[in-house]
């Protein structure tokens, strides 16, 4: 990896023992300066593999609300608005980091956690299994 | 929101002043017990709106490596393998939380940051602009 010289102004609280505990400022900086006009706003409805968004709430997690996509159909929507079963609607999944309160119910002590979320759906050609 | 009784065993380091600083254990707990076999592994190639994955690396960020999807085509791939320009390949974007080293180059001091990432692509019907 890349070695970065340590800033002499860093808080002096490093612990060599794992689990490693660090200080995190929860005042979120929003870097979403993405100017791409193609934002995901209504794609869930206009997609050939449309999806519904389900609210997943957990007060012990930060962020407490995560939206999960569930594909509406097994197949994909064709030009006539019908479901084509020779194609598959599948969820696009991503691993994201969240903060889990640890010990539970503590307002200022967390553990990093990786969770898998479905962000949306895409239409794929199925894998055909040939029988010998 | 939901009020949670505070655990008496919590570390006593709460600061009422924003920016709020918390302790985070970086020993990641992986909750990916998802048994769904439809993982996003090869969807980027099999999708009717295929995408390429570009590595975005930043040693000042945790995680330092994030993969960004870029749709391969303006339109979507049809059954003949040609591009259908009457459909659009669009990126599915998601806001995720990352940790940004703050002050820079500090190994144990971070600030939460929201960034927008493109996770994959989906095929959508275009918005038709009707001329009066």
């Amino acid at each position: 990896g890349i070695t970065i010289p340590r800033n002499p102004g860093c808080p002096n609280s490093e612990d060599k023992n794992f689990p490693r505990t660090v200080m995190v400022n929860l005042n979120i900086h929003n870097r979403n300066t993405n100017t791409n006009p193609k934002r995901s706003s209504d794609y869930y409805n206009r997609s050939t593999s449309p999806w519904n968004l389900h609210r997943n709430e957990d007060p012990e997690r930060y962020p407490s609300v995560i939206w999960e996509a569930k594909c509406r159909h097994l197949g994909c929507i064709n030009a006539d608005g019908n479901v084509d079963y020779h194609m598959n609607s599948v969820p696009i999944q991503q691993e994201i980091l969240v903060l889990r309160r640890e010990p539970p119910h503590c307002p200022n002590s967390f553990r990093l956690e990786k969770i898998l979320v479905s962000v949306g759906c895409t239409c794929v050609t199925p894998i055909v299994h040939h029988v010998a | 929101g939901i009020t949670i009784p505070r655990n008496p065993g919590c570390p006593n380091s709460e600061d009422k002043n924003f920016p709020r600083t918390v302790m985070v254990n970086l020993n990641i707990h992986n909750r990916n017990t998802n048994t769904n076999p439809k993982r996003s592994s090869d969807y980027y190639n099999r999708s009717t709106s295929p995408w390429n994955l570009h590595r975005n690396e930043d040693p000042e960020r945790y995680p330092s490596v994030i993969w960004e999807a870029k749709c391969r085509h303006l339109g979507c791939i049809n059954a003949d393998g040609n591009v259908d320009y009457h459909m659009n390949s669009v990126p599915i974007q998601q806001e995720i939380l990352v940790l940004r080293r703050e002050p820079p180059h500090c190994p144990n001091s971070f600030r939460l940051e929201k960034i927008l990432v493109s996770v994959g692509c989906t095929c959508v019907t275009p918005i038709v602009h009707h001329v009066a």
Epitope: - | W51, N52, C71, R72, H73, L74, N82, Y85, H86, V131
Partner: antibody, heavy 110, light 107 residues
Framework: EVQLVESGGGLVQPGGSLRLSCAAS????????ISWVRQAPGKGLEWVGS????????YYADSVKGRFTISADTSKNTAYLQMNSLRAEDTAVYYC???GQRYAMDVWGQ | DIQMTQSPSSLSASVGDRVTITCRAS??????LAWYQQKPGKAPKLLIY???SRASGVPSRFSGSGSGTDFTLTISSLQPEDFATYYC?????????FGQGTKVEIK
């Protein structure tokens, strides 16, 4: 002003090579395909190929597949058409054009 | 590939005439059809996109119609600067294909 400027044409022997350039200005280069269209003397328009600048995908007419290569340098806002193994029937005026899904080929080189 | 057939291949007309050029696609292309005008020694110029929408700066005497497989370009009152060759193009799917062109000449 939105414009495309081609360069690099010339006289070449059969079997030879030539590279054409298409410099774009005045628009977001990555939101479109850049298409190459040719016109043989006294004939109609023929699509040669395209490049989707954002995704990097390239497309070719069967008549040039394997001989012509389209590429782009997004830092220079320039697309290229590399023509190898040239034949007499490739003799034509070559145009580059901006292609979008809504307006088709709305901007052409000179 | 989608074939585009234009007719007529050439026509003679006078200033002030109403001129109609037709274009037929080998399969349905919805409204993904464009019309271009080309004058000798010049690059083509977009006239109509989406079968019926006029491109910026195109005079109102030019109009397009049709959907599916049959399309028409109409010049309501031919002007001296309209003598040129006109091409239709489908952009429904790749490969992009053009009609063979219609040359409008002075009678």
């Amino acid at each position: 002003e939105v414009q495309l400027v081609e360069s690099g044409g010339g006289l070449v022997q059969p079997g030879g090579s030539l590279r054409l350039s298409c410099a774009a200005s005045g628009f977001s280069f990555t939101s479109y395909e850049i298409s190459w269209v040719r016109q043989a003397p006294g004939k109609g328009l023929e699509w040669v190929g395209s490049i989707y600048l954002w995704g990097g995908s390239t497309y070719y007419a069967d008549s040039v597949k394997g001989r012509f290569t389209i590429s782009a340098d997004t830092s220079k806002n320039t697309a290229y058409l590399q023509m190898n193994s040239l034949r007499a029937e490739d003799t034509a005026v070559y145009y580059c054009a901006r292609f979008g899904q809504r307006y088709a080929m709305d901007v052409w080189g000179q | 590939d989608i074939q585009m057939t234009q007719s007529p291949s050439s026509l003679s007309a006078s200033v002030g005439d109403r001129v109609t050029i037709t274009c037929r696609a080998s399969q349905s292309i919805s409204s993904y059809l464009a019309w271009y005008q080309q004058k000798p020694g010049k690059a083509p110029k977009l006239l109509i996109y989406g079968a019926s929408s006029r491109a910026s700066g195109v005079p109102s005497r030019f109009s397009g119609s049709g959907s599916g497989t049959d399309f028409t370009l109409t010049i309501s009152s031919l002007q001296p600067e309209d003598f040129a060759t006109y091409y239709c193009q489908q952009y429904y799917s790749s490969p992009l294909t053009f009609g063979q062109g219609t040359k409008v000449e002075i009678k």
